[in-house]
Interface confidence: low
Amino acid sequence: DTEIKVNPPQDFEIVDPGYLGYLYLQWQPPLSLDHFKECTVEYELKYRNIGSETWKTIITKNLHYKDGFDLNKGIEAKIHTLLPWQCTNGSEVQSSWAETTYWISPQGIPETKVQDMDCVYYNWQYLLCSWKPGIGVLLDTNYNLFYWYEGLDHALQCVDYIKADGQNIGCRFPYLEASDYKDFYICVNGSSENKPIRSSYFTFQLQNIVKPLPPVYLTFTRESSCEIKLKWSIPLGPIPARCFDYEIEIREDDTTLVTATVENETYTLKTTNETRQLCFVVRSKVNIYCSDDGIWSEWSDKQCWEGEDLSKKTLLR
């Protein structure tokens, strides 16, 4: 009984289309597949950033696969051919592995790359990224930001830089159509007459870096002799009400400090008739139903009631 063997895929390579970390892994069918014309050959692909402990594993019938990587590090991948048991009258047959690697040869020492990169998607509308120049780089060093997400034909350069002392230290992005819930890739590279500058790569999803506007129109209403309802309005913009969490900070007579996190635009507070002063502020954040992470808004303006019977007055009017 001759042992059934199959070759690994041919021409296995990692191709960089210039999307700042979104790479193509592609290959060709193995040689000598003639014996298995009636079979659908499958491929098991494993890949990771060099240094990562775990491989991502994909089984596919296609001759290509696409995914995002951290280009600050190298990438390694391996692939082999799988013949399912239906083709071999028994157990599955695997080829040996074909392996490949990819990395961008780094220019400049790590200290020349941008420091403290910080990106915030304000109110789910306006993306702003800022950074500090690398350690010890000269004033002739300038940084350029490029970005890409699925839907763009090619990587785009920032057209509205924030500058300090003639250097680019940030970018105000234009309207980014259909850019959330997918990886957003950024490269900040640099140029200097004196020394090569190391590029930096960043990947995130915009819905996870949203900083909403603070809530507005805070009001008080006396619900009963011992209950006061605090109300506020969601800030304007594209974020739906169901996506907000709120944190409230309440001071009573300058002594107690109550903090609470709520999902709705109201909060009922137990109080005493002796309460002479009540102040509260609210801030908002995108909740777990709409993102994996987020940034708290600034606190709202403080709203206070003081020295008047709350039962007779609804505040802010």
Epitope: V216, Y217, L236, G237, P238, D301, K302, C304
Partner: antibody
Framework: QVQLVQSGAEVVKPGASVKLSCKAS????????MNWVKQRPGQGLEWIGR????????HYNQKFKDRAILTVDKSTSTAYMELRSLRSEDTAVYYC????????????WGQGTLVTVSS | DIQMTQSPSSLSASVGDRVTITCRAS??????????MNWFQQKPGKAPKLLIY???RQGSGDPSRFSGSGSGTDFTLTISSLQPEDFATYFC?????????FGQGTKVEIK
């Protein structure tokens, strides 16, 4: 609670100037814009302009650009409007009104100051 | 400048009536998915009071019988059940472009 208290009524002669004040309390003055609105007796409302109480940035209705000057004094949380070269059609009630941002409306108004231009 | 045209200029109604006031802008007042349209109520000798902002959002402390709708150029203020304190003049106002402009007003009188 939020309060905008405006200065008292003024009677001025044609060609003269007047400076109206609007003292804010009960909120963080520098977080808001202050708008000024004109209303002639029995007429509608006319927006004069606004000033960012934090940065001092101003936006004017071109109709008033050369004659209205908006300023703020952050230390006293007071907004001012100076109207120059007054004429009879400037006889009106002038309101200050705070605004959080373009889409949020002018949510609190002063009680108004009546300016009468008469010789 | 964006022109704002309100209709009717006045109307007579009874307590409990449903009242509708319309406002048309000479060009769209929408931007960023928001309608920059506000509605104010003014009583004689008093300052205007914000009822509705961003076309449909209620100003704080305002009764729920006031509602706003519309987008682009055509907007409506509705009072679902007119109350005695609602007899006043109502103004629409756009805040999309400087100079901000108001409608000429709609006076709601007792029938």
């Amino acid at each position: 609670q939020v309060q905008l208290v405006q200065s008292g009524a003024e009677v001025v002669k044609p060609g003269a100037s007047v400076k109206l004040s609007c003292k804010a309390s009960g909120y963080t003055f520098t977080n808001y814009w202050m708008n000024w609105v004109k209303q002639r007796p029995g007429q509608g409302l006319e927006w004069i302009g606004r000033i960012d109480a934090y940065a001092g940035e101003t936006h004017y209705n071109q109709k008033f650009k050369d004659r209205a000057i908006l300023t703020v004094d952050k230390s006293t949380s007071t907004a001012y409007m100076e109207l120059r070269s007054l004429r009879s059609e400037d006889t009106a009630v002038y309101y200050c009104a705070r605004g959080y941002g373009d889409a949020y409306g002018m949510d609190h108004w002063g009680q108004g100051t009546l300016v009468t231009v008469s010789s | 400048d964006i022109q704002m045209t309100q209709s009717p200029s006045s109307l007579s109604a009874s307590v409990g009536d449903r009242v509708t006031i319309t406002c048309r802008a000479s060009e769209s007042v929408d931007n960023y998915g928001i309608s920059f349209m506000n509605w104010f109520q003014q009583k004689p000798g008093k300052a205007p009071k914000l009822l509705i902002y961003a076309a449909s959002r209620q100003g704080s402390g305002d009764p729920s019988r006031f509602s706003g709708s519309g987008s682009g150029t055509d907007f409506t203020l509705t009072i679902s059940s007119l109350q005695p304190e609602d007899f006043a003049t109502y103004f629409c106002q756009q805040s999309k472009e400087v100079p901000w402009t108001f409608g000429q007003g709609t006076k709601v009188e007792i029938k």
